[in-house]
């Protein structure tokens, strides 16, 4: 849908970066503007397929919102649509452009196109430091200090505030107490313990908006521990037929974890073996020996069998830990509103699945002795 | 804090089938590994088998044949039954969590095989 | 089966000296997953070190592990009066899981 006469539309541009990422484009427009953000390749060179995000989540096409590869155009803006926008590859998720976005009262007048000036406005908060506030969760061991921070801004300057799972957090909640260090949009806990466990939520606000941010902490009482996944990944994706597809599991174990990469299937029609348990097959398995490893899967040249549902597992001698998640896979006609969507994170299983292996697939692999874990299987 | 506790018979007969079972508190046995461990009168350590929350199991080659490790999840307990028992199956039991290497342990129960 | 020994059988030392305790392993143990127990009398073992050289929570700085391979060492930098009793490796790399037959640290 074009914009409408009453409607202007301004446009802010940002090249592709070289290895770096990007330095965040600090943008403003006026209330009822077209927002139009665009992220061009220098020389025009291909980026691959991409995806628009506002402030780490997914945007989903609207009636409202616009989104083509290297173009993203939201109309008539209101506050609630500033904040930190990317662009992100597709499969790799890296960060093609970073745009800071705040929306002013006064409609802008599409001179600003440098940015410079746009200090002065008033506008709702914003990320300072998006790139600072990826780690999500915070794996530490009983009695380290911990620190979560927020940088942002705004005008007037924002005020920040903290929840713990979704309820006002104080000092005398807990036993240490905590340090708000207001100047460094931070909350610091010193000397964890297991009751510190949970997400905390910064809500940064001022008159014109609201932003927050939530960080999951485990507090590890003890080592050694069973693995821990970060929280929403691997994320459900949904592909078009043909395109590569990455997935990221994210794991934390200080015992040498077991790492794989499984997906359901059927055999001889059933999903599920003589005992009901599921079977799944290897797709990729190693050992890691670091405390945290990002685990990745790629799936090249996707086909309609290709979809369904996978888990990534880690396996250490203490447990398990698994997370389930879908791949769908679309023909080329796929509404692209689709594709845009960021879907609801999988269900967990707590039971094993049955392993299965292309040679045999009636065969059963049992879960998971440290033996198991030097006969590796790669399919 | 997770403890363990090991229940059951202290003596058992001959060629009679030895039953213990462990008892998990301050955690869910669910997605963990759980061991049963035994040390004989000369304090050799031995690593009998374990079991995953879901059921599936692993045992030492050289009592295969005579030993099942079950999981009851609702309850929050495994077992251990070896059948068979002779003199030589007198040891201190002992329940744990883990798959091999072991963390937590309960105190023991000693099983004497005698007639 | 993989066997390992332990050395010596029992270490005669004062308080306040290092301790060196050798657990060798018939065939090679990877990725380290060797760990080594204390066991001190009437208790069940506790878990000292797992993964070759990383220490459970819990348990004082003064107790280390190292090695790899074949040859692991648990190494206690200053003992004092609560060491003097029986330590244990074990291999977890390949079933079944077995135990060496032990040191016991006696008061010189």
């Known amino acids: 849908e074009p914009p409408g006469p009453e409607q202007r539309v301004v446009r802010r541009a940002a090249e592709v970066p070289g290895p770096e990422p990007s330095q965040q484009e600090q943008v403003a427009f006026g209330s009822g503007d077209t927002v139009e953000l665009s992220c061009h390749p220098p020389g025009g060179a291909p980026t691959g397929p991409t995806v628009w995000a506002k402030d780490g989540t997914g945007l989903v096409a609207s009636h409202r919102i616009l989104v083509g590869p290297q173009r993203l155009q939201v109309l008539n803006a209101s506050h609630e649509d500033a904040g930190v926008y990317s662009c992100q590859h597709r499969l790799t998720r890296r960060v093609l452009c970073h745009f800071s976005v705040r929306v002013t009262d006064a409609p802008s007048s599409g001179d600003d196109e440098d940015g410079e000036d746009v200090a002065e406005d008033t506008g709702a908060p914003y990320w300072t430091r998006p790139e600072r506030m990826d780690k999500k969760l915070l794996a530490v061991p009983a009695a380290n200090t911990v620190r979560f921070r927020c940088p942002a801004a705004g005008n007037p300057t924002p005020s920040i505030s903290w929840l713990k799972n979704g309820k006002e957090f104080r000092g005398e909640h807990r036993i240490g107490g905590i340090k708000l260090r207001h100047q460094q949009w931070s909350l610091v806990m010193e000397s964890v313990v297991p009751s510190d466990r949970g997400n905390y939520t910064c809500v940064v606000e001022n008159k014109f908006g609201s932003i927050r941010q939530t960080y999951t902490l485990d507090v590890l009482e003890r080592s050694p521990h069973r693995p821990i996944l970060q929280a929403g990944l691997p994320a459900n994706q949904t592909a078009i037929l043909g395109s590569d597809v990455e997935f990221h599991c994210k794991v934390y174990s200080d015992a040498q974890p077991h790492i794989q990469w499984l997906k359901h299937v059927e055999v001889n029609g059933s999903k599920v073996g003589p005992d009901g348990t599921p079977y799944v097959t290897v797709l990729k398995s190693w050992i890691s020996e670091n405390v945290e490893a990002d685990a990745r899967l790629r799936l090249a040249n996707v086909s309609e069998r290709d979809g369904g549902e996978y888990l990534c597992r880690a396996t250490n001698f203490i447990g398990v830990a698994e997370k389930a998640f879908w791949l769908r896979v679309h023909g080329p006609q796929a509404a692209e509103e689709e594709l845009m969507e960021t879907d609801e994170a999988g269900s967990v299983y707590a039971g094993e699945q049955k392993l299965i292996s292309e040679e045999d697939l009636g065969g059963e692999q049992k879960l998971i002795s440290e033996e198991d874990l030097h006969h590796h299987h790669h399919h | 804090q997770v403890q363990l506790q090991e229940s059951g018979p202290g003596l058992v007969k001959p060629s009679e089938t030895l039953s213990l079972t462990c008892t998990v508190s301050g955690d869910s046995i669910n997605s963990y590994f759980w061991s049963w461990i035994r040390q004989l009168p000369g304090k050799e350590l031995e690593w009998i088998g374990h079991?995953?929350?879901?059921?599936?199991?692993r045992y030492n080659p050289s009592l295969q044949s005579r030993v099942t490790i079950s999981i009851d999840t609702s309850k929050n307990q495994f077992s251990l039954k070896l059948s068979s028992v002779t003199a030589a199956d007198t040891a201190v039991y002992y329940c744990a969590r883990g798959a091999s290497a072991v963390d937590y342990w309960g105190q023991g129960t000693l099983v004497t095989v005698s007639s | 089966e993989i066997v390992l020994t332990q050395s010596p059988g029992t270490l005669s030392l004062s308080p306040g000296e290092r301790a060196t305790l050798s657990c060798r392993t018939s065939?090679?143990?990877?990725?380290?997953?060797l760990a080594w127990y204390q066991q001190k009398p009437g208790q069940a073992p506790r878990l000292l070190i797992y993964g070759a050289s990383r220490r459970a929570t819990g348990i004082p700085d003064r107790f280390s592990g190292s090695g790899s391979g074949t040859d692991f060492t648990l190494t206690i930098s200053r003992l004092e009066p609560e060491d003097f009793v029986v330590y244990y490796c074990?291999?977890?790399?390949?079933?079944?899981?077995?135990f060496g037959q032990g040191t016991k640290l006696e008061i010189k």
């Open positions: 074990q291999q977890y790399g390949s079933s079944p899981y077995t």
């Open positions: 079991i995953y929350s879901s059921g599936s199991t």
């Open positions: 065939q090679s143990i990877s990725s380290g997953y």
